[in-house]
Interface confidence: medium
């Protein structure tokens, strides 16, 4: 490049040359300083002067440069007689996250300047998402056909999935990167021989207040014709907050007859339009034999006959449970599948995904919605997440 100027070996740092003074000279010096939240570590004063050999020299430390170290604003603790100060730190997690460690989160500086925890050594803790603790839980006095608007964000685990043919279904966030849904939802508008790789790019997924998240892969349950379940892995972990939070997976089976669960959903309403607002309904777990008789005429295998009032037969087996309509004739409907049957454990003040809605065709016509028991699939879920 021809700039038309002589190029010298001195950088122009925009600093004007200081004026000369009689019987004096200009000595070049610099002062090192640190950015916000850092402080200078040096035995000198941070001022360096240019010597004859064009080296920057500090009076106290010579050419040894200072360092900037994090300033945690922590004053040095006072010394005590016959004692010493032991440096220790406690790791804590931000809101909506909790510490995962076998230790207590307290680390002490050893002689080799390593931070060590008594129980786990130098293995650091991790912050994992809190599950099942919505900031504004659903009001128990308060389709989904009918139901109540979730104005408060009481179901932060509820995701909305849209197929490439624009059909809305549900999915349930179970950790920062994984969601449960039904295999049928994943196969919507796909042929039976579609693979998980074919399906993933055709889905659009939203969490929280219509926050778009990208799907990395889907994994179908190995026995998905009988266990209507699939897992969705996101490309990135979601940030957990008031609007987005996973639901906990249960350590016990909450699907006891009469227990009330909450089902939220984006499914069809009384106009058979997909609802613009997340709705929820409270539904009781039903007697399984009554449910089987309702859909299949009998609990005796050889006497069974398809008799679904809505013309479509649900999958009913040892991996499923049924929930009845509410006393207000509220019910789940098309598009609510994949949503959780969420049970609030009052003692733990924690919400658990007891079931995943599989048969969402009841729409206040048939008496029961059908859910896959989460306890039946938990081992597979944990194994799949660990392997992926």
């Amino acid at each position: 490049v021809d700039s038309g100027n002589d190029v010298t070996d001195i950088a122009d740092d925009g600093c004007p040359k200081p004026p000369e003074i009689a019987h004096g000279y200009v000595e070049h010096s610099v002062r090192y300083q640190c950015k916000n939240y850092y402080k200078l570590r040096t035995e000198g004063d941070g001022v360096y002067t240019l010597n004859d050999k064009k080296q920057w020299i500090n009076k106290a430390v010579g050419d040894k440069l200072p360092e900037c170290e994090a300033d945690d604003g922590c004053p040095k603790p006072p010394e005590i007689a016959h004692g010493y100060v032991e440096h220790s730190v406690r790791y804590q997690c931000k809101n909506y996250y909790k510490l995962r460690t076998e230790g207590d989160g307290v680390y002490t500086l050893n002689n080799e300047k390593q931070w060590i925890n008594k129980a786990v050594g130098d293995k650091l803790p991790e912050c994992e998402a809190v599950c099942g603790k919505p900031k504004n839980p659903a009001n128990p006095v308060q389709r989904i056909l009918g139901g109540h608007l979730d104005a408060k964000g009481s179901f932060p685990w509820q995701a909305k999935m849209v197929s490439h043919h624009n059909l809305t279904t549900g999915a349930t966030l179970i950790n920062e990167q994984w969601l449960l849904t039904t295999a049928k939802n994943l196969f919507l508008n796909h042929s039976e021989n579609a693979t998980a790789k074919d399906i993933a790019p055709t889905l659009t997924l939203y969490v929280g207040k219509k926050q778009l998240v990208e799907i990395e892969k889907v994994v179908l349950h190995p026995n998905y014709s009988q266990v209507d379940i699939g897992l969705i892995k996101l490309k990135q972990k979601v940030s957990v907050n008031e609007r987005v939070m996973p639901i906990c997976l249960p350590s016990k089976d909450y699907a006891e007859v009469g227990r009330v669960g909450y089902v939220s959903g984006w499914g069809r309403n009384a106009n058979f339009k997909f609802t613009d607002h997340l709705k929820y309904v409270m539904l009781p777990v039903a007697d399984q034999d009554q449910c089987i008789r309702h859909y299949e005429g009998s609990t005796v295998p050889e006497k069974k006959t398809p008799k679904s009032p809505v013309g479509v037969q649900p999958i009913l087996n040892e991996h499923t449970f049924c929930a009845g309509m509410s006393k207000y004739q509220e019910d789940t409907c098309y598009g609510d599948a994949g949503s959780a049957f969420a049970v609030h454990d009052l003692e733990e003040d924690t919400w658990y995904a007891t079931g995943i809605l599989s048969f969402d065709k009841s729409c206040a016509v048939a008496e029961y919605g059908v859910y896959v028991k989460v306890t039946s699939i938990q081992d597979w879920v944990q194994k799949t997440i660990a392997e992926n």
Partner: antibody, heavy 115, light 107 residues
Framework: EVQLLESGGGLVQPGGSLRLSCEAS????????MTWVRQSPGKGLEWVSS????????YYANSVKGRFTISRDNSKNMLYLQMNDLRAEDTARYYC????????WGQGTMLTVSS | DIQMTQSPSAMSASVGDRVTITCRAS??????LAWFQQKPGEVPKRLIY???SLQSGVPSRFSGSGSGTEFTLTVSNLQPEDLGTYYC?????????FGPGTKVDIK
């Protein structure tokens, strides 16, 4: 714009049967909920029955459940209401309407149940 | 079932008046509410849907508000042609129900 036209009303004796029809023209109603609403002389409006588009799920008011049957023929753009075991209190003008929020109404057809 | 109540049941107002009709649902219905006008001897006509959306072709003097269980229909500048009976109706879940109606006549 869709127009709805009801027909089939008339005078029937108690215990009798009748079928009302509603023809939609100007636009297809196959993708919409369809509904029957009635109004007894000098009285207010009462929802009777609704049918979803596809699959055709049916919903009834308690007062007609077990006696009335709603159906539709999407290929003909028709809605029907089969009324059995008619009672004096079923006397009313019957309207067919589109959707569950009734954005479009027909002119209605009068049913009188009397001996 | 969700019960709908309306008040007043009847009213008399002058041309140019601002008229307000209230509708209450016995329990939560979100914004799934419509208002209808029925003139004597005529078919009901929808004025408002989704609690506050104006049906196309309906004069802007009609407006709706509310959500949850309390709803209002307002006619800001009553005209002679506005006489008739006004009904609210929820479409939140089945069974669908109407309010008993408010009869408006012109003084």
């Amino acid at each position: 714009e869709v127009q709805l036209l009801e027909s089939g009303g008339g005078l029937v004796q108690p215990g009798g049967s009748l079928r009302l029809s509603c023809e939609a023209s100007g636009s297809s109603v196959s993708s919409h909920f369809m509904t029957w609403v009635r109004q007894s002389p000098g009285k207010g409006l009462e929802w009777v029955s609704s049918i979803s588009p596809n699959p055709a799920y049916t919903y009834y008011a308690n007062s007609v459940k077990g006696r009335f049957t709603i159906s539709r023929d999407n290929s003909k753009n028709m809605l029907y209401l089969q009324m059995n075991d008619l009672r004096a209190e079923d006397t009313a003008r019957y309207y067919c309407a589109r959707r569950s929020d009734f954005d479009t109404w027909g002119q209605g057809t009068m049913l009188t149940v009397s001996s | 079932d969700i019960q709908m109540t309306q008040s007043p049941s009847a009213m008399s107002a002058s041309v140019g008046d601002r008229v307000t009709i209230t509708c209450r649902a016995s329990r939560y219905i979100g914004k799934d509410l419509a208002w209808f006008q029925q003139k004597p001897g005529e078919v009901p006509k929808r004025l408002i849907y989704d609690a506050s959306s104006l049906q196309s072709g309906v004069p802007s003097r009609f407006s709706g508000s509310g959500s949850g269980t309390e709803f209002t229909l307002t006619v800001s500048n009553l005209q002679p042609e506005d006489l008739g009976t006004y009904y609210c109706q929820h479409y939140y879940t089945f069974p669908l129900t109407f309010g008993p109606g408010t009869k408006v006549d012109i003084k």
